[in-house]
């Protein structure tokens, strides 16, 4: 029985500025370079030590970037991701998704790049919820010795 | 993880060709950016081309001379060397990165670019 890899979700709005070498990190997708399945979005595969992106410590490699100075990055070809990368200008405003994952149950194997998964609170709620009447069931138990 | 290993290095004389191949580890090798790069004797490391998901660049000193080219079904880049020169005379190195730059391609003339790099191939002209 393979466990889900669960992640929560958050959106962020990190304003750049272009340094002496650039923005300094990479980028994986696109709608002819699918990194992840079922997803052509633009993901940051690496950021460069002490780079402009680095620097400022928002971003995170494995974060998908949702927009550049507005712009939506839906089905776009990943070298014309890369190019309005590089001529968004000087002061560079990204839209990103951050991924923070948590793994439940068992270990399983999930394909490199997969973010699929549920939101955290979904499975926090019902274990908090247990987890009270669990205890409110002890104590009234122990009322009773 | 990604390995890289190298072949096709060896003696050739002035004027002739060889083709570089470095065979890389990974299900994700078509989203990497590759590179080679040589050092000769009592030299620093020196960028000689490299090859992203549609670009490509080239040093000055083999420009017209080398191509860098990219098999993403034999997760394999290769580096045709022709009209080869003393000059040329080095341990090739293969190198390889995630993704592509959304800087300037010329980034990737810089070793610092890269996180994974093969154990290089002789190359003499003689």
């Known amino acids: 029985m393979n466990g889900r890899v669960d992640y929560l979700v958050t959106e962020e709005e990190i304003n750049l500025t272009r340094g002496p070498s650039g923005l300094g990190f990479n980028i994986v997708g696109g709608t002819d370079q699918q990194y992840v399945s079922n997803d052509s979005g633009i993901y940051v595969s690496r950021i460069k030590e002490n780079g402009a992106a680095a620097l400022d410590g928002r971003l995170q490699e494995g974060d998908k970037i949702l927009s550049v100075n507005g712009q939506d990055l839906k089905n776009l070809l990943h070298q014309d991701a890369v190019d309005l990368f590089r001529n968004a200008g000087y002061a560079v405003s990204l839209r990103v998704q951050h991924r923070l994952q948590v793994q439940n149950g068992p270990i399983g194997h999930r394909g490199e790049g997969d973010p699929s998964g549920i939101p955290i609170f979904m499975v926090l709620v019902p274990v908090f919820a247990l987890t009270m009447v669990a205890a409110w069931a002890f104590m009234r138990y122990r009322q009773q010795l | 993880d990604v390995q890289l290993v190298e072949s096709g290095g060896g003696l050739v004389q002035a004027g002739g060709s060889l083709r570089l191949s470095c065979a890389a580890s990974?299900?994700?090798?078509?989203?990497?950016?590759m590179g080679w790069f040589r050092q000769a004797p009592g030299k620093e490391r020196e960028f000689v081309a490299a090859?992203?998901?549609?670009?490509?660049l080239y040093s000055d000193s083999v420009k017209g001379r080398f191509t860098i080219s990219r098999d993403n079904a034999k997760n394999t880049v290769y580096l045709q060397m022709n009209s080869l020169k003393p000059e040329d005379t080095a341990v090739y190195y293969c190198?390889?990165?995630?993704?592509?730059?959304?800087?300037?391609?010329?980034?990737?003339?810089?070793?610092?670019?890269?996180?994974?790099w093969g154990q290089g191939t002789q190359v003499t002209v003689s």
């Open positions: 190198a390889a990165v995630q993704g592509s730059p959304v800087d300037t391609i010329v980034v990737l003339t810089t070793s610092e670019e890269y996180d994974y």
């Open positions: 090859v992203t998901w549609s670009e490509t």
């Open positions: 990974g299900r994700t090798f078509s989203t990497y950016t």
